[in-house]
């Protein structure tokens, strides 16, 4: 004999009616639904001092459905959970809790970080960068000819941007000094433009080598703990002007 979904009817009581409304299989004038049609959930609704049986196509928010041979019923999710498949598998936590593997947590476990948008615990994502591209041609004021000292630049791409707790990205631009190839410039020859940005002439005391973009130095730091406040960065800007370092682009 086959069991069926909510089809087994209760023994008839004097006030039980077969002409039921809204998905009821059996009902009474006083208690409303007593059993439901297949694939419907039985729930009790309080109306004043009275509880009335209703049949629902899905359980309300904060409840989950459980199937039994003679009835499908709605059961409350755990107190910290808004929606769930069952008491052990929450799918959305109440405000202030983070969802991780079907559980609602006050804080995310070690190695994970809280995403305050989705209210989930997510893996920490570190920055990933590509290999360096080849160096650009050596140029001085946009010319690739002459006997002057010039600069050449190389770049790399960010493959994976870091999450809030992830390691910051290292520099994605690097510039170094070089000698422009030894050939005389033809009259009016402009030369190939280099890939580096045009920069102001260095001030007194500045290195005439690669000129740093001080903002970009932030991105070369590897761990969040090393992030500095603006005052410290200003201090460093002055110090860095005396150093010869690579140019990098902020992301």
């Amino acid at each position: 004999q086959n069991a069926s979904r909510g089809r087994r009817q209760r023994r008839m009581h004097p006030n039980v009616s077969q002409g039921c409304q809204g998905g009821c299989a059996t009902c009474s004038d006083y208690n409303g639904c007593l059993s439901c049609k297949p694939r419907l959930f039985f729930a009790l609704e309080r109306i004043g001092m009275k509880q009335i049986g209703v049949c629902l196509s899905s359980c309300p928010s904060g409840y989950y459905g459980t199937r039994y041979p003679d009835i499908n019923k709605c059961t409350k999710c755990k107190a910290d959970c808004d929606t769930c498949f069952n008491k052990n598998f929450c799918t959305k936590c109440k405000s202030g809790f983070y969802l991780h593997l079907g559980k609602c947590l006050d804080n995310c476990p070690e190695g994970l970080e809280a995403n305050n948008h989705t209210m989930e615990c997510v893996s920490i994502v570190h920055c990933e960068v590509s290999e360096w591209n080849p160096w650009s041609p050596c140029t001085k004021k946009g010319k690739t000819c002459g006997f002057k000292r010039g600069t050449e630049t190389r770049v790399r791409e960010i493959i994976q941007h870091p999450s809030a707790k992830g390691n910051l990205c290292p520099p994605t631009n690097e510039t170094r000094k070089c000698t422009v190839q030894r050939k005389k410039c033809q009259k009016g020859e402009r030369g190939k433009k280099g890939r580096e940005r045009k920069r102001k002439k260095p001030n007194k005391g500045e290195s005439k080598e690669a000129i740093p973009d001080s903002k970009s130095l932030e991105s070369s730091k590897e761990i969040p703990e090393q992030r500095e406040n603006k005052q410290q960065q200003k201090k460093r800007k002055v110090q860095d002007k005396q150093k010869s370092v690579s140019v990098s682009t902020v992301h």
Partner: antibody
Framework: QVQLVQSGAEVKKPGASVKVSCKAS????????IHWVRQAPGQGLEWIGY????????GYNQKFKNRVTMTVDTSYSTAYMELSRLRSEDTAVYYC??????????WGQGTTLTVSS | DIVLTQSPASLAVSLGQRATITCKAS??????????MNWYQQKPGQPPKLLIY???NLESGIPARFSGSGSGTDFTLTINPVEAEDVATYYC?????????FGAGTKLELK
Amino acid sequence: QVQLVQSGAEVKKPGASVKVSCKASGYTFTDYSIHWVRQAPGQGLEWIGYIYPSNGDSGYNQKFKNRVTMTVDTSYSTAYMELSRLRSEDTAVYYCATYFANNFDYWGQGTTLTVSS
Amino acid sequence: DIVLTQSPASLAVSLGQRATITCKASQSVDYDGDSYMNWYQQKPGQPPKLLIYAASNLESGIPARFSGSGSGTDFTLTINPVEAEDVATYYCQQSNEDPLTFGAGTKLELK
């Protein structure tokens, strides 16, 4: 009667993305969550994740979390599962299924995905 | 993750005989008196089909020769008597925790 009809077979190159559809009929689409399960050739069943058509909330198996996106179009009673950065190990039959009170009671016919260079 | 270990991996049974498949969970799949264990049948080229829900309840339209039992970590699917149309692969599946997991399957053949 309840029916889930999935999109046709797909052949993709490694690194590409695929989007599989699952059209539901015979019931109110927003009443039950839709889950996706896959089965590699000659292998067992592996749960990918779920979506609630009523509000679009979704949840994924950690294994797929950074590569899978589930969406719905309630006007067409259709669920979608997109898998990105495909690799050869993603070659499998992908099923959608309705989840009724903690079990998968109706399944789509399956969509075969082949990932090959 | 809850790991479900099915045994045997394959099984050959004569028509009319009993087939017994077991599923052992790495941790309990019970909560509040309910067992979140389901059984599915899958025939080649077809999607799985629900047979048993909540460990022991027969899905509508499934023949009564299929039955399920067990609680906690140990569950059994019994087919008695086995018929020719029962040749298939059978999977257990737990719904108690995220992620939902399946057993590796048991292939039923005729002797």
